[in-house]
């Protein structure tokens, strides 16, 4: 017979999603079993029929990835998750609503922190994300958010930081005392969609003046 | 060397339509985010709509939403602005521009559009 | 929509000058802040972006400085070819949405 409460097989259905890497995980309830077997459907919001998940049916692991079926930006999508303990009870979980563009949460860039006597110089590489554009290309978080910026950080000393942000991708921090060590800190940021990321962070020394030796 | 060059502007009645064109040349054309932007007779400047080339992701200012439409060709390098239902007040010069390492520097030399009756 | 509200609409300088144009944003947008000039019957051009740093090609007369909602353009000797429009644009979010600029005229 079917429990009192699928909470006792299934709970915590939901989508964590990172640069747009979509994964479907759930845990166990307290009457869960390590035989326990999971199967993954999901459907488009506004489609009746959900779509059984290849590769994700009678699994025992608790994640799925449902990136390339949830890749198109402009939708909306549910998953459910179906429990099958070893003694045939089942339960069944439907995530909330999906929008990998609303979910999505940004893992700090990646940067390049170049040491120079007085400046140090940060380079951020464009972040790919698994979502292909028509041409096959991968589109990175720049195609996707228009009002995407690096904010970065230079912390100076304990009381004094200098900052800098911009849409482009190279920076350079002026005016530093040669032969010294900084905290730099990059994040992402997507105002529009109130999204920040962690930060990259960078410990670099600049390059000691020679020109007096 | 970047150039961009805009055409279709004319005089056009109101409720009529009006395809623009740009063609750019001297940058990826096919991995960047395109512009326009309008000038009011005397008046000052107004970003209308944006696309990326590569996501086909579009925004456009709420006093054209439904009315215009931004699109690209990416094998022709060529970006157009579709303008439908045209009213007296989108009478202007319409520029289209093209950000390049983070930064809307470079703009065509703007196609004067006039609705009138 | 952030609102960019440009001072003053128009200014009368003398050659050799120092010309300060102010820009207040609705809301505060970092440093995305740039700012143009524009000619008659000419596109704009840019000529400060990030709030402070000078695109190339721009002489330095031109300065730029200001965070979060308060900016300010400086023109420290006004020359004959600075007579023209200036606009405050911000980069922060759609719309990207200018000042109502400021005429620089000869006095």
């Known amino acids: 017979h079917a429990p009192e409460d699928p909470s006792d097989l299934l709970q915590h259905v939901k989508f964590q999603s990172s640069n747009f890497e979509n994964i479907l995980t759930w845990d166990s309830g307290p009457e869960g079993t390590p035989d326990t077997v999971y199967s993954i459907e999901y459907k488009t919001y506004g489609e009746r029929d959900w779509v059984a998940k290849k590769g994700c049916q009678r699994i025992t692991r608790k994640s799925c990835n449902l990136t390339v079926e949830t890749g198109n930006l402009t939708e909306l999508y549910y998953a459910r998750v179906t429990a099958v303990s070893a003694g045939g009870r089942s339960a069944t979980k439907m995530t909330d609503r999906f929008s990998s563009l609303q979910h999505t949460t940004l893992k700090p860039p990646d940067v390049t922190c170049i040491s120079k006597v007085r400046s140090i110089q940060m380079i951020v590489h464009p972040t790919p994300t698994p979502i292909r554009a028509g041409d096959g290309h991968r589109l990175t978080l720049e195609d996707i958010f228009h009002d995407l910026f690096y904010h970065l950080e230079l912390q100076v000393n304990r009381t004094y930081q200098m900052h800098l942000g911009g849409k482009q991708r190279e920076y350079e921090f002026f005016g530093l005392t040669p032969d010294t060590e900084f905290l730099g800190t990059i994040m992402i940021c997507v105002p529009t969609w109130a999204k920040e990321s962690a930060p990259y962070m960078c410990r670099v020394k600049t390059l000691p003046d020679r020109t007096w030796t | 060397e970047v150039q961009l060059v805009e055409s279709g502007g004319g005089l056009v009645q109101p409720g009529g339509s009006l395809r623009l064109s740009c063609a750019a040349s001297?940058?990826?054309?096919?991995?960047?985010?395109m512009y326009w932007v309008r000038q009011a007779p005397g008046k000052g400047l107004e970003f209308v709509s944006v696309i990326n080339t590569r996501s086909g992701i579009t925004h456009y200012v709420e006093s054209v939403k439904g009315r215009f439409t931004i699109s690209t060709d990416n094998a022709k390098n060529t970006l157009f602005l579709q303008m439908n239902s045209l009213k007296s007040e989108d009478t202007a010069v319409y520029y289209c521009?093209?950000?390049?390492?983070?930064?809307?520097?470079?703009w065509g030399q703007g196609t004067q559009v006039t609705v009138s009756s | 929509d952030i609102q960019m509200t440009q001072s003053p609409s128009s200014l009368s300088a003398s050659l050799g000058d120092r010309v300060t144009i102010t820009c207040q944003a609705s809301?505060?947008?970092?440093?995305?802040l740039a700012w143009y000039q524009q000619k008659p019957g000419q596109a704009p051009k840019l000529l400060i972006y990030g709030a402070s740093r000078l695109q190339t090609g721009v002489p330095s007369r031109f300065s730029g400085s200001g965070s979060g909602t308060s900016f300010t353009l400086t023109i420290s000797g006004v020359e004959a070819e600075d007579l023209a429009t200036y606009y405050c644009?911000?980069?922060?979010?759609?719309?990207?949405?200018f000042g109502q600029g400021t005429k620089v005229e000869l006095k």
């Open positions: 001297g940058f990826t054309f096919s991995s960047s985010w």
């Open positions: 521009a093209t950000r390049i390492q983070g930064l809307i520097d470079y």
């Open positions: 809301q505060s947008i970092s440093s995305l």
């Open positions: 644009l911000q980069d922060y979010s759609w719309p990207l949405t």
